[in-house]
Amino acid sequence: LQDLCSNCPAGTFCDNNRSQICSPCPPNSFSSAGGQRTCDICRQCKGVFKTRKECSSTSNAECDCISGYHCLGAECSMCEQDCKQGQELTKKGCKDCCFGTFNDQKRGICRPWTNCSLDGKSVLVNGTKERDVVCGPSPADLSPGASSATPPAPAREPGHSPQ
């Protein structure tokens, strides 16, 4: 009997109620492999999810996130709110990065500017909420009489104070 079931292709299930005949998956269900005893319920993309690929008898639906949200999880199993560059998501919504930190994406968190002095370099371009600092040559590499256009980066990593 097991051998009969193994003959059932993807898109069908082995129906015990019908002498193990291969029956098509019912609407809104699928089987992606052969020999299945049941079909799986199709994923529904609703709420903050939108459909990227419709469910078929042999493959599950695939979801994306609606505008203003981004996917998390191996198969976009979650949607998280976007923020602007220079912000991060907190309990109080999207908040600007604290001084000394930046976020160049619509997702993720604010992280400290690179500390140029740790590599013996100077700050060539100051950091902003949206961009990291750009490190330049070390002060010793500068020609005599020349000086860095901007002060060196803070010696310690900046912390986050509650807003």
């Epitope: 998280e80 930190t101 997702r107 604010c110 912390g159």
Partner: antibody
Framework: QVQLQESGPGPVKPSETLSLTCAVS?????????WSWVRQPPGKGLEWIGE???????YYNPSLKSRVTISVDTSRNQFSLKLSSVTAADTAVYYC??????????WGQGTLVTVSS | SSELTQDPAVSVALGQTVRITCQGD??????ASWYQQKPGQAPVLVIY???NRPSGIPDRFSASDSGNTASLTITGAQAEDEADYYC???????????FGGGTKVTVLG
């Protein structure tokens, strides 16, 4: 579907360096995610070790910072952990994970590393 | 000591409700994430953000928070919910991660 797989040489002797690699499949390591290492000693809780971005930028757990190096190889779609001067206290299951805004949304199955002479 | 504090263990009768708490200064500003871990398996994310469940996580799992305390509630606990549960958030720096010590949930009956 993104999947992570840890691999390493197995047992490590005290004072030696532990080396592990995490292979990323079903997606690019150059996506806008960070890639973390987390460990769990037998019968104990989870401990975050550190993380890396595809640019090579890293952050480490301060308690391990002096011994940890995390690197990334975008051409092989993998990232690696090195932990130096290991002791028996470093015996643990080591997990790699994908991190997004503090959410570890995809995990490897973990690999047990035993430190023993 | 961990920057996120959890009770080590809690038990609940089958079908009843259990609440797990997680305390830490960073939780005043940022939400905790919650992970379920069964023996010999990798952790699985069950709650993130204010009270969001990944697809596939049953709606008996929910989260709430107040001040510096985050809570995970299992309403109508099932035998398969027996596991260790870890909260996670940022450490004091704001850009590194930390886990709570974990809470072992035992489902009785």
């Amino acid at each position: 579907q993104v999947q992570l797989q840890e691999s390493g040489p197995g047992p490590v002797k005290p004072s030696e360096t532990l080396s592990l690699t995490c292979a990323v499949s079903g997606g690019s390591i150059s996506s806008s995610h960070w890639w973390s290492w987390v460990r769990q000693p037998p019968g104990k809780g989870l401990e975050w070790i550190g993380e890396i971005y595809h640019s090579g930028r890293t952050y480490y757990n301060p308690s391990l910072k002096s011994r940890v190096t995390i690197s990334v190889d975008t051409s092989r779609n993998q990232f690696s952990l090195k932990l130096s001067s290991v002791t028996a206290a470093d015996t643990a299951v080591y997990y790699c994970a994908r991190e997004d805004g503090g959410i570890m949304d995809v995990w490897g199955q973990g690999t047990l590393v035993t430190v023993s002479s | 000591s961990s920057e996120l504090t959890q009770d080590p263990a809690v038990s609940v009768a089958l079908g009843q409700t259990v609440r797990i708490t997680c305390q830490g200064d960073s939780l005043r500003r940022f939400y905790a994430s919650w992970y379920q871990q069964k023996p010999g398996q990798a952790p699985v994310l069950v709650i993130y953000g204010k009270n969001n469940r990944p697809s596939g996580i049953p709606d008996r799992f929910s989260a709430s928070d107040s001040g510096n305390t985050a809570s995970l509630t299992i309403t109508g606990a099932q035998a398969e919910d027996e596991a260790d549960y870890y909260c996670s958030s940022r450490d004091r720096s704001g850009y590194r991660w930390v886990f709570g010590g974990g809470t072992k949930v035992t489902v009785l009956g």
